[in-house]
């Protein structure tokens, strides 16, 4: 805390300018009016204040706005945002996308800080849903943003926002997240033709059910192995050898290299060895000829 002392004669700040960098901390406290600072916040960013001096300026704003800063001040915080704690940010009501962008710019190129995470959370909650413009902005600054959300939070993403998602935005998503995003993507892209649809839906397929994979296998999509390996195991298991062959097209040869890894390994165990042999890849581990396969889960469902 800076002690309260009278401002020396002639040092009262008339405006926020570079002369203030030569003020000692106590002089800043005594000579800079908080209301003046609030109205000229946009100037602070261009002035090379030390972090200790920024502490004083923050203290002045905190005294002026104990319930949280107004958006007119927040939008121009610039580097002073780095001084804010998550507790400070929780008091804010940020509604403008321009304000969000201005503050994200301060953190650009670095991992998401607790301050930024809190800011985004406040902003999204204030909006009620993750609309396309917000998602566009957030994924531009943080490609992994979507995958940092819980399935519950993702459920508030409207299908229209899915158009903003790029493949790299989904790199770190787990199956539970893709389970939520896939139906939204399917809805968003439903009016596209076959090949265009596949290009768009491909990165979301980790959430696709068996019936959708079967449908895709009828469309000559030539899914690559990397995409196939990210599919849900429970969705892949019921696919026949013929369906997988159609789904992968020329990439089917890649199954050999992946035969020890899920979901390929588990899928092989479910296929007749005779059928696997038709691929000519030397895949081993299928059900030997003459064995009867009982689907007990089906039997339980019927009883």
């Amino acid at each position: 805390e800076v002690e309260k002392t009278a401002c020396p004669s002639g040092k009262k700040a008339r405006e926020i300018d570079e002369s203030l960098i030569f003020y000692k901390k106590w002089e800043l406290e005594a000579c800079v009016d908080a209301a003046l600072l609030a109205t000229q916040m946009d100037r602070v960013n261009a002035i090379p204040f030390t972090y200790e001096q920024l502490d004083v300026l923050k203290h002045k704003l905190d005294e002026l706005y104990p319930q949280g800063y107004p958006e007119s001040v927040i939008q121009h915080l610039g580097y002073l945002f780095l001084k804010m704690s998550p507790e400070d940010i929780r008091k804010w009501n940020v509604t403008s996308l321009e304000t969000l962008k201005a503050l994200l710019e301060v953190n650009k190129g670095h991992e998401m800080s607790p301050q930024v995470a809190t800011l985004i959370d406040r902003f999204v909650k204030g909006r009620g849903q993750l609309d396309k413009d917000t998602l566009d902005t957030l994924t531009a600054f943080y490609p992994g943003y979507l995958c940092s959300l819980s399935p519950e939070e993702l459920s508030s993403v409207p299908p229209s926002s899915i158009w903003a998602v790029r493949p790299q935005d989904l790199d770190t998503c787990d199956p539970r997240q893709l389970d939520v995003l896939y139906p939204k993507a399917r809805l968003a892209f439903q009016n596209m033709n076959g090949s265009e649809y596949f290009v768009k839906i491909q990165s979301f397929l980790g959430g696709a059910p068996t019936e959708d994979l079967k449908a895709l296998s009828q469309q000559n999509v030539s899914m690559d192995l990397a995409t196939f390996m990210k599919l849900r195991t429970d969705a892949v298991l019921p696919l026949t050898v013929a369906e997988v062959q159609k789904l992968l097209g020329p990439h089917v040869e890649g199954l050999k290299a992946e035969e020890r890894h899920r979901p390929v390994r588990d899928w092989i165990l479910r296929q007749r060895q005779d059928d696997l042999d038709t691929l000519g890849l030397g895949l081993q581990g299928g059900i030997p000829n003459g064995y009867l396969v009982l689907d007990l889960s089906m039997q339980e469902a019927l009883s």
């Epitope: 030390t50 580097y79 650009k108 190129g109």
Partner: nanobody, 119 residues
């Protein structure tokens, strides 16, 4: 992190000149300003001159017209050309850099270099 190393201090007669240098290394990509502070015997540390990454310089009244600060962005080095030195300029001179982004925002300081102005 960011490291700052000063050089160029020494003993000089009144009216003489010295040129201080400060080289930054490490996380130099986010430096928004560099400056020189000094601390004389029994005094608080005070700002002498500062220059932003865009080349804007500011000087304390006591050194205006005598000192000149400059920055070589490519070498991440800041210089302080000190002319017409006076005994009251005697101090330890510290280099300072502002780093304004995560993950390590803050003020970074060098170890200091002694400047003594005496006949």
């Amino acid at each position: 992190q960011l490291q700052l190393v000063e050089s160029g201090g020494g003993l000089v007669q009144p009216g003489g000149s010295l040129r201080l240098s400060c080289a930054a290394s490490g996380s130099v990509n986010s430096i928004t300003a560099m400056g020189w502070y000094r601390q004389g015997p029994g005094n608080e540390r005070e700002l002498v001159a500062v220059i932003t990454d865009r080349g804007r310089a500011s000087y304390a009244d006591s050194v205006k017209g005598r000192f000149a600060i400059s920055m070589d962005n490519d070498k991440h080095t800041v210089y302080l050309q000190m002319d017409s030195l006076k005994p009251e300029d005697t101090a330890v001179y510290y280099c300072n850099a502002h780093r304004r982004t995560w993950p390590h925002p803050g003020d970074y300081w060098g170890q200091g270099t002694q400047v003594t102005v005496s006949s």
